[in-house]
Amino acid sequence: APMGSDPPTSCCFSYTSRQLHRSFVMDYYETSSLCSKPAVVFLTKRGRQICANPSEPWVTEYMSDLELN
Amino acid sequence: APMGSDPPTSCCFSYTSRQLHRSFVMDYYETSSLCSKPAVVFLTKRGRQICANPSEPWVTEYMSDLELN
């Protein structure tokens, strides 16, 4: 972000309790290092952003899979 | 957001140091109480989101003005 622009930052305070369908997930990003809770945000085909727990095996699996593709 | 959708939450970690031009500001929202810092986010005509300190007089003034309009 440009200096002085001060936009808000996306943080997660809860995680999805359900494993997402892999076919719905298009991309992901780790939340900011300023956020108190570690999280991965998955971006879906419908444009939704969903918080997920990076310590869950399906989350790291999806991240690896998306990286390869 | 629908239950269980767990989208990320907008949080502010710094505030704009400059007072925004009132004519540029179209809307605002207060950040979640889950965020570590209280903040108001102003939405500008250009679609930018800018974090502001709710304890500053100009911020509360703009909020009141936007409520009335």
């Epitope: 972000a1 991309d27 990003y29 780790e30 900011s32 300023l34 990076p54 310590s55 790291t60 | -």
Partner: antibody, heavy 115, light 107 residues
């Protein structure tokens, strides 16, 4: 494949500053935070801080606030760490690493502060 | 800050031994505990992430277990190439912290 490339060594005089680079390739740079770690024989591994390339957010270990400044340039997929007011205490190996699990590390830059 | 205490500081082994390395956290780090191996003059290498998740390319003799504050890295049949330093690290809270390490050496 994922790579984080760092210059091998930097020799700097006391009081000066140095800006180290960490060039990322093989993945989407904005998807992961980049962490910086200091390693010395006496102190072991110390987390300096992290930068989020997506938006430039930074967080620091209190011990390194005022000493380190982290930035990221999306156009070149490169993260930077500037260290200022260098002393012999800053002589160490500095690593960049990717993501919460630090799954990939750079080769490390050996910083020597000496007159 | 979360303090990670590793024990023993040094472990003398014979090839073929099964060994366990301990990492104790001063407060709960949930599942955000990772293990790294570092050989002399090399960068650390991720061995196990999130307590027990295996890493592609890492031999299956390495495994991790534990929860909350007590964690273990096990090597079920040590090979000479496994000699070096082993560090645990937590990414549950800022600042991320590392243990002081366990040195694996030949008996």
């Amino acid at each position: 494949q994922v790579q984080l490339q760092q210059p091998g060594a930097e020799l700097v005089k006391p009081g000066a500053s140095v800006k180290m680079s960490c060039k990322a390739s093989g993945y989407t740079f904005t998807s992961y935070n980049i962490h910086w770690v200091k390693q010395t024989p006496g102190q072991g591994l110390e987390w300096i801080g992290a930068v989020s390339p997506r938006n430039g957010d930074t967080s620091y270990n209190q011990r390194f606030k005022g000493k380190a400044t982290l930035t990221a340039d999306i156009s070149s997929s490169t993260a930077y760490m500037q260290l200022s007011s260098l002393t012999s205490e800053d002589s160490a190996v500095y690593y960049c690493a990717r993501g919460y699990g630090y799954d990939y590390w750079g080769q490390g830059t050996t910083l020597t502060v000496s007159s | 800050d979360v303090v990670l205490t590793q024990s023993p500081a040094t472990l003398s082994v014979t090839p073929g031994d099964r060994v366990s390395l301990s990492c104790r956290a001063s407060q709960s780090v949930s599942k955000y505990l990772h293990w790294y191996q570092q050989k002399s003059h090399e960068s650390p290498r991720l061995l196990i992430k999130y307590v027990s998740q295996s890493i592609s390319g890492i031999p299956s003799r390495f495994s991790g277990s534990g929860s909350g504050t007590d964690f273990t890295l096990s090597i079920n049949s040590v090979e000479t190439e496994d000699l070096g330093m082993y560090f645990c690290q937590q990414s549950n809270s800022w600042p991320h912290t590392f243990g002081a390490g366990t040195k694996l050496e030949l008996k």
